[in-house]
């Protein structure tokens, strides 16, 4: 969800902190576009429904993405 109708990108600040995949409600990967020229990763946490912006360049976040995609591939037939 963009922060407004007038700002281009959602993530003003980003986090390098590891996120436990089990605490995730949803993980959105928003590709770069004309609207926002860079990839944004937004994690919605189960607790409080808080949305966190994650650093796509962080090793911990890259590991999280791998873990999530592995989990998804297990579920899909």
């Amino acid at each position: 969800v963009p922060l407004s109708r007038t700002v281009r990108c959602t993530c003003i600040s980003i986090s390098n902190q590891p996120v436990n995949p089990r605490s995730l409600e949803k993980l959105e990967i928003i590709p770069a576009s004309q609207f926002c020229p860079r990839v944004e990763i937004i994690a919605t946490m189960k607790k409080k429904g808080e949305k966190r912006c994650l650093n796509p360049e962080s090793k911990a976040i890259k590991n999280l993405l791998k873990a999530v995609s592995k989990e998804r591939s297990k579920r899909s037939p």
Partner: antibody
Framework: QEQLVESGGNVVQPGRSLRLSCAAS????????MHWVRQAPGKGLEWVAV????????YYADSVKDRFTVSKDNSKNTLYLQMNSLRAEDTAVYYC?????????????WGQGTMVTVSS | EIVLTQSPAILSLSPGERATLSCRAS??????LAWYQQKPGQAPRLLIY???NRATGIPARFSGSGSGTDFTLTISSLEPEDFAVYYC??????????FGGGTKVEIK
């Protein structure tokens, strides 16, 4: 501990320029967007400007647009506000503030403020 | 520009009493509202963001509620250190970010 320290405030004449600095310590400055917020004597808070964590996006209040420029040097852990064509109504305490590390716009760490007085 | 109106302007209460502060927006801001506390000569401090999420280190006596145009900050039992000015701030459809005019909570 996490800290923001502003400097550069002064008494200046209308029409002149001033540059404020905000030195950050105790946290990873390069991952945080930053804001400037001001408070005129005895008045409420007024948002001035924002800059994204990587310096890519900047937005301003209409009252300062085309006169003020926000910038960020991640290698020096420092935020700046270049203020040109100063007016009497720019007189205020200027605070730098860190944007919270969630997908929201809120200020979770503030400096102590620096006073700018515009007077002839 | 979205205008935030805070009421009352001044709230006179005694320690231990419950404080209820109101912030009304000129149009819907969804849940995009934050609350700050400011004491004389100090910088503001974030209390609540996203209408109801308590910021790190904020005591449980502070709570936020509301959505759309009407929001409330409640201090369940006032401590001596809670007497201060409180501001609300919205980020819907920004820039600009806007603040309310403030509510001063003073000792009765």
């Amino acid at each position: 501990q996490e800290q923001l320290v502003e400097s550069g405030g002064n008494v200046v004449q209308p029409g002149r320029s001033l540059r404020l600095s905000c030195a950050a310590s105790g946290f990873t400055f390069s991952t945080y967007g930053m804001h400037w917020v001001r408070q005129a004597p005895g008045k409420g808070l007024e948002w001035v400007a924002v800059i994204w964590y990587d310096g890519s996006d900047k937005y301003y209040a209409d009252s300062v647009k085309d006169r003020f420029t926000v910038s960020k040097d991640n290698s020096k852990n420092t935020l700046y506000l270049q203020m040109n064509s100063l007016r009497a109504e720019d007189t205020a305490v200027y605070y730098c503030a860190r944007n919270i590390a969630v997908a929201d716009v809120a200020f979770d760490l503030w400096g102590q403020g620096t006073m700018v007085t515009v007077s002839s | 520009e979205i205008v935030l109106t805070q009421s009352p302007a001044i709230l006179s209460l005694s320690p231990g009493e419950r404080a209820t502060l109101s912030c009304r927006a000129s149009q819907s801001v969804s849940s995009y509202l934050a609350w700050y506390q400011q004491k004389p000569g100090q910088a503001p401090r974030l209390l609540i963001y996203d209408a109801s999420n308590r910021a790190t280190g904020i005591p449980a006596r502070f709570s936020g509620s509301g959505s759309g145009t009407d929001f409330t900050l409640t201090i369940s039992s006032l401590e001596p250190e809670d007497f201060a000015v409180y501001y609300c701030q919205q980020r819907s459809n920004w820039p600009p970010l806007t603040f309310g005019g403030g509510t001063k909570v003073e000792i009765k």
